[in-house]
């Protein structure tokens, strides 16, 4: 699997999409997990509804939500109020029994909010939305890492 990079702005919401073959993964629950180290395990963050037929219902764990379009074949993960510690490697997974198939490998990059460096005195800042439904989702910038490309090049 290639790794797809999704970039979001600190404090905003980032939407990650994982397309898959809906028939190949028919009847399968999905999950979003965080990769712990290069060879480490992938730690489950959130998974879709226990009843596959209800996978379209949004489930959340803290600031992360997941929903699955099982007919269209798109798993969507929303990371709300993105923070620097959210940056890292993740996976979208398809679950069966104790096995997990990787649908997509994802690198989340968190960009500094360009507004942070201005005088915010005259700016209207909306109150933080209480629900995912009301949250503003910034369209993410995504690209695939080229083969051999280092995600975080060493700084000189």
């Amino acid at each position: 699997h290639n790794t797809t990079v999704f970039q979001g702005v600190e404090g905003q919401s980032l939407q990650v999409s994982c397309p898959y073959d809906s028939m190949k993964h028919w009847g399968r629950r999905k999950a979003w997990c965080r990769q712990l180290g290069e060879k480490g395990p992938c730690q489950r963050v959130v998974s879709t509804h226990n009843l596959w037929l209800l996978s379209f219902l949004r489930r959340r764990n803290g600031s992360t939500a997941i929903t699955d379009d099982t007919l269209g074949g798109t798993l969507t993960i929303t990371l709300r109020n993105l923070q620097p510690h959210d940056a890292g490697f993740y996976q979208c997974q398809s679950l069966h029994g104790s096995e997990a198939d990787t649908l997509r490998k994802v690198l989340v990059e968190v960009l500094a909010d360009p507004l942070d460096h201005r005088d915010a005195g005259d700016l209207w800042v909306p109150g933080e939305s209480e629900s995912f439904e009301d949250a503003h989702v910034e369209h993410s910038i995504s690209r695939s890492l080229l083969e051999g490309e280092i995600p975080f090049p060493p700084t000189s």
């Epitope: 073959d21 028939m23 190949k24 993964h25 009847g27 596959w52 069966h96 029994g97 104790s98 096995e99």
Partner: antibody
């Protein structure tokens, strides 16, 4: 009507190569996994591996990894099981089966009639 | 790899009687268990999947109880066409594994 039709019986010598086939009809061949199961004479069933013809994603049971190759040609709705160098211990009946996935569990719901492979010098 | 064991190896039953077949897994397979029937010279036939769901066309005399590591297939009243070998299959963990089978023959 869903059908899996396998190629005919084969008699081979040790060291020879072989490819047997399993042709699906009556359903969308690219939308279901196809598994291969071995049954040695007078013995039980052994899971060999599985392929998803839609994208040729293939998984092998560790016991069969490197011993056989599973492939599929979706243009003719056919899955294959092949050996590059047969051994006498490969003598067995080989079945292909369709795996149907669903909310209540997975099921090998349709099976081919089996292909008997005999390897003898 | 999960090891499946079946008991007894052979079960001798008279037609009309009840047959009880056991399948045990070396670790939990949740409800990811199927049962197959195989007659001599034929391909296996799916009976039960998802631990307890009967496949299309399978009569109600076939039922399964249990989940996790212990499962029981019960044939409430054996008919002549039920004398065969029965296999359980787990596909909770890779690779999927079959039990060695239970032969049900006529007493």
């Amino acid at each position: 009507e869903v059908q899996l039709v396998q190629s005919g019986a084969e008699v081979k010598k040790p060291g020879e190569s072989l490819m047997i086939s399993c042709k699906g009809s009556g359903y969308s061949f690219t939308s279901y996994w196809i598994g291969w199961v071995r049954q040695m004479p007078g013995k039980g069933l052994e899971w060999m591996g599985i392929i998803y013809p839609g994208d040729s994603d293939t998984r092998y049971s560790p016991s069969f990894q490197g011993q056989v190759t599973i492939s599929a040609d979706k243009s003719i709705s056919t899955a294959y099981l092949q050996w590059s160098s047969l051994k006498a211990s490969d003598t067995a009946m080989y079945f292909c089966a369709r795996r149907r996935q669903g909310i209540w569990g997975d099921a090998l719901d349709f099976w081919g009639q089996g292909t008997l492979v005999t390897v003898s010098s | 790899e999960i090891v499946m064991t079946q008991s007894p190896a052979t079960l001798s039953v008279s037609p009309g009687e009840r047959a009880t077949l056991s399948c045990r897994a070396s670790q939990s397979v949740s409800s990811n268990l199927a049962w197959f029937q195989q007659k001599p010279g034929q391909a296996p036939r799916l009976l039960i999947y998802g631990a307890s769901t009967r496949a299309t066309g399978i009569p109600a005399r076939f039922s399964v109880s249990g989940s996790g590591t212990e499962f029981t297939l019960t044939i409430s009243s054996l008919q002549s066409e039920d004398f065969a070998v029965y296999y359980c299959l787990q596909d909770n963990n890779w690779p999927p594994t079959f039990g060695p089978g239970t032969k049900v023959d006529i007493k």
